[in-house]
Amino acid sequence: GCINITSSASQEGTRLNLICTVWHKKEEAEGFVVFLCKDRSGDCSPETSLKQLRLKRDPGIDGVGEISSQLMFTISQVTPLHSGTYQCCARSQKSGIRLQGHFFSILFTETGNYTVTGLKQRQHLEFSHNEGTLS
């Protein structure tokens, strides 16, 4: 089977959503956990993560082969404390298989804005607190 993990971010007003999406087959969901770590280059695990989620066992319909499971970590107001390196990972508690997504970073600037870099879908995202828009 093939399990794919991607990272993305979205902004809703002052909130920043960090999203880990895993695409997988039904039969691959058993025992799999997706999790998001911060500043954990070597020991990212469900136990040290910011949030974890078990993969869906059911896509909700029967006419599809793949399921997407989505972990969303919401930062209500980004502060300098949120600056750092983040990574989406997944692990099977049955087989021990580990998946590691690309590292991405939040950089809080002196002007009160923040930048998210390293995301594969959008190479560079900049968010402004003052205007609350994607800049």
Epitope: K26, L53, R54, K56, R57, D58, P59, G60, I61, D62, G63, V64, S68, S69, Q70, L71, M72
Partner: antibody
């Protein structure tokens, strides 16, 4: 045993909103899709949408997108369906129902008792 | 959206007779079809899953068949408690949809 217990009957005025709850017990709430279905008096069954409480993935039929909001509270194993901008045509019995695990059951194997919504000025 | 068309809308039969209910899908849905029974004032009850698979606790007189676009629910010998409304429902794709229902009434 699996049980879905819904909130009581509601009477609302046109333009108002309603939030119906469905408390689940007897199974792992986060592992199953919860459906919301309605039935107008003397009519058939109409699927509104469904939510997967494990990751809050929600799907809606086009007719209700933007007017219905499905949520789930993992801590209390309760699913909610909020319907806004109510009109008289929304008068119906609203059901929550659990979808059985794919390829094993697939259909809606457990149903709530139904919540009657009356929209009248 | 997959449209499910049930026929007939009403079926008038006597106890002991055989009932044959039809459900037709607007496009192929493999065997991803389920049947429900609903009695007045009650929530629907799952009768048959995946077109032909039986459900624990449902009498053996209820059976289902079909695949693709044409499906049939058969009640081999109607009992008094079987007079009700029957719905089909597809789980092949979003949005999930129901058929309009067939009412089985006493002749």
């Amino acid at each position: 045993q699996v049980q879905l217990v819904q909130s009581g009957a509601e009477v609302k005025k046109p333009g108002a909103s309603v939030k119906v709850s469905c408390k689940a017990s007897g199974y792992t709430f986060t592992d199953y899709w919860m459906q919301w279905i309605r039935q107008a008096p003397g009519q058939g069954l109409e699927w509104i949408g469904s939510i997967y409480p494990g990751d809050d993935d929600a799907r809606y039929t086009q007719k209700f997108r933007g007017r219905a909001t499905l949520t789930a509270d993992k801590s209390t194993s309760t699913a909610y369906m909020e319907l806004s901008s109510l009109r008289s045509e929304d008068t119906a019995v609203y059901y929550c129902a659990r979808r059985g695990i794919a390829a094993v059951v697939g259909g809606f194997d457990y149903w709530g008792q139904g919540t009657t919504l009356t929209v009248s000025s | 959206e997959i449209v499910l068309t049930q026929s007939p809308a009403t079926l008038s039969l006597s106890p002991g007779e055989r009932a044959t209910l039809s459900c037709r899908a607007s496009q192929s849905i493999s065997n991803h079809l389920h049947w429900y029974q609903q009695k007045p004032g009650q929530a629907p009850r799952l009768l048959i899953k995946y077109a032909s698979q039986s459900i624990s606790g449902i009498p053996a007189r209820f059976s289902g068949s079909g695949s693709g676009t044409d499906f049939t629910l058969t009640i081999s010998s109607l009992e008094p408690e079987d007079f009700a409304v029957y719905f089909c429902q597809q789980s092949n794709s979003w949005p999930l949809t129901f058929g309009g229902g067939t009412k089985v009434e006493i002749k």
